[in-house]
Interface confidence: low
């Protein structure tokens, strides 16, 4: 069916980067400036995405592909195709509705985005804490407590709180 239709449809011959111009007896016209067609046989070209404001251009628009945006420094991409930009926080923090907040004791975040995660509970694996955790780093688990001198202990952090409706924290 596709093959039959394509033989009858002059627009099917129009390659990517062009459109089938009904105003010009269905000839293949190049996409106008700031527009593109990523597939052949299209009757219109799509308007190029413009990376404005907090968005910046990662890849320029061409006649066959849309522009791609990322975020200006201090922000990171969210959503499909970087449809939104969200504020960065520092390591050891997470973004809340009130801005960047330090991770609670027993949790850490080693990135500029995302949420604070609980420290690993070494004792669950029969190990002990070799290096204590910080706001920025998880604990490092070492040998089992039996292999260590008396007094070694594992850290069991409190469960992280949540901000309801938005994000597990």
């Amino acid at each position: 069916f596709e093959r039959t239709r394509s033989l009858q449809d002059p627009c099917s011959n129009c390659p990517a980067g062009t459109f089938c111009d009904n105003n010009r007896n269905q000839i293949c016209s190049p996409c106008p400036p700031n527009s593109f067609s990523s597939a052949g046989g299209q009757r219109t070209c799509d308007i190029c995405r413009q990376c404005k404001g907090v968005f910046r251009t990662r890849k320029e628009c061409s006649s066959t592909s849309n522009a791609e945006c990322d975020c200006t420094p201090g922000f990171h991409c969210l959503g499909a195709g970087c449809s939104m930009c969200e504020q960065d926080c520092k390591q050891g923090q997470e973004l809340t509705k009130k801005g960047c907040k330090d991770c609670c004791f027993g949790t850490f975040n080693d990135q500029k985005r995302g949420i604070c995660r609980p420290w690993t509970n070494c004792s669950l694996d029969g190990k002990s804490v070799l290096v204590n955790g910080t706001k920025e780093r998880d604990v490092v688990c070492g040998p089992s407590p039996a292999d260590l001198s008396p007094g070694a202990s594992s850290v069991t952090p409190p469960a992280p709180a949540r901000e309801p409706g938005h994000s597990p924290q």
């Epitope: 449809s83 939104m84 949420i115 949540r162 938005h166 994000s167």
Partner: antibody, heavy 121, light 107 residues
Framework: QVQLVQSGAEVKKPGSSVKLSCKAS????????INWVRQAPGQGLEWMGN????????NYNQKFKDRVTLTVDKSTSTAYMELSSLRSEDTAVYYC??????????????WGQGTLVTVSS | DIQMTQSPSSLSASLGERVTITCKAS??????LSWFQQKPGKAPKTLIY???RLVDGVPSRFSGSGSGQDYTLTISSLQPEDIATYYC?????????FGGGTKLEIK
């Protein structure tokens, strides 16, 4: 590409229950909240609740808390909304929509096509 | 629950005209407000989030403003494709609550 595909229309009797599904594809299911929003014919939008698939944490609108149950099946990337004790005023289109895990500015960036539930005796 | 009072409930405007829709919250919502556009038989589409941030791909003729309890959606020059119903949504507190909607028609 990202898609939320909802189950088909339902006709139910007052007092019965209905369970709607929302199958997600094209993204990491566990990294987004699934919200349920309904719209009665010719009326506005009403948020019913949401669920975080990673650990099934839920928030409910108190208006529906006793009648709505949100669940997920991570193996099939499907979210479910069950509404019990149906009454005629529950006749509405029910939408599922997602919000990003870390995103405090709740942008519902993708929506299902909606499921019409008709409650009639 | 936070109540969102949206006005007007319907609005008739000419093409090219500047259109303004307002939403008033029953308490301060700290700019946690989105605006949606919904066309008949379709799911809503987010236009604005955090009161004034335009979702990428939404035409720049749409803008949002406001703070505290009072918020505004403005269409600087009405186009045929803007004919739809518009809703505001507060998400400062659970449950998120929508305004009653504004049906926009061509004069």
């Amino acid at each position: 590409q990202v898609q939320l595909v909802q189950s088909g229309a339902e006709v139910k009797k007052p007092g019965s229950s209905v369970k709607l599904s929302c199958k997600a594809s094209g993204y990491t299911f566990s990294s987004y909240w699934i919200n349920w929003v309904r719209q009665a014919p010719g009326q506005g939008l009403e948020w019913m609740g949401n669920i975080y698939p990673s650990d099934s944490y839920t928030n409910y609108n108190q208006k529906f808390k006793d009648r709505v149950t949100l669940t997920v099946d991570k193996s099939t990337s499907t979210a479910y909304m069950e509404l019990s004790s149906l009454r005629s005023e529950d006749t509405a289109v029910y939408y599922c929509t997602r919000t990003w895990e870390f995103y405090y500015d709740s942008v519902f960036d993708y929506w299902g096509q909606g499921t019409l539930v008709t409650v009639s005796s | 629950d936070i109540q969102m009072t949206q006005s007007p409930s319907s609005l008739s405007a000419s093409l090219g005209e500047r259109v303004t829709i307002t939403c008033k919250a029953s308490q301060d919502i700290n700019s946690y407000l989105s605006w949606f556009q919904q066309k008949p038989g379709k799911a809503p589409k987010t236009l604005i989030y955090r009161a004034n941030r335009l979702v990428d791909g939404v035409p720049s003729r749409f803008s949002g403003s406001g703070s505290g309890q009072d918020y505004t959606l403005t269409i600087s020059s009405l186009q045929p494709e803007d004919i739809a119903t518009y809703y505001c949504l507060q998400y400062d507190e659970l449950p998120p609550t929508f305004g009653g909607g504004t049906k926009l028609e061509i004069k």
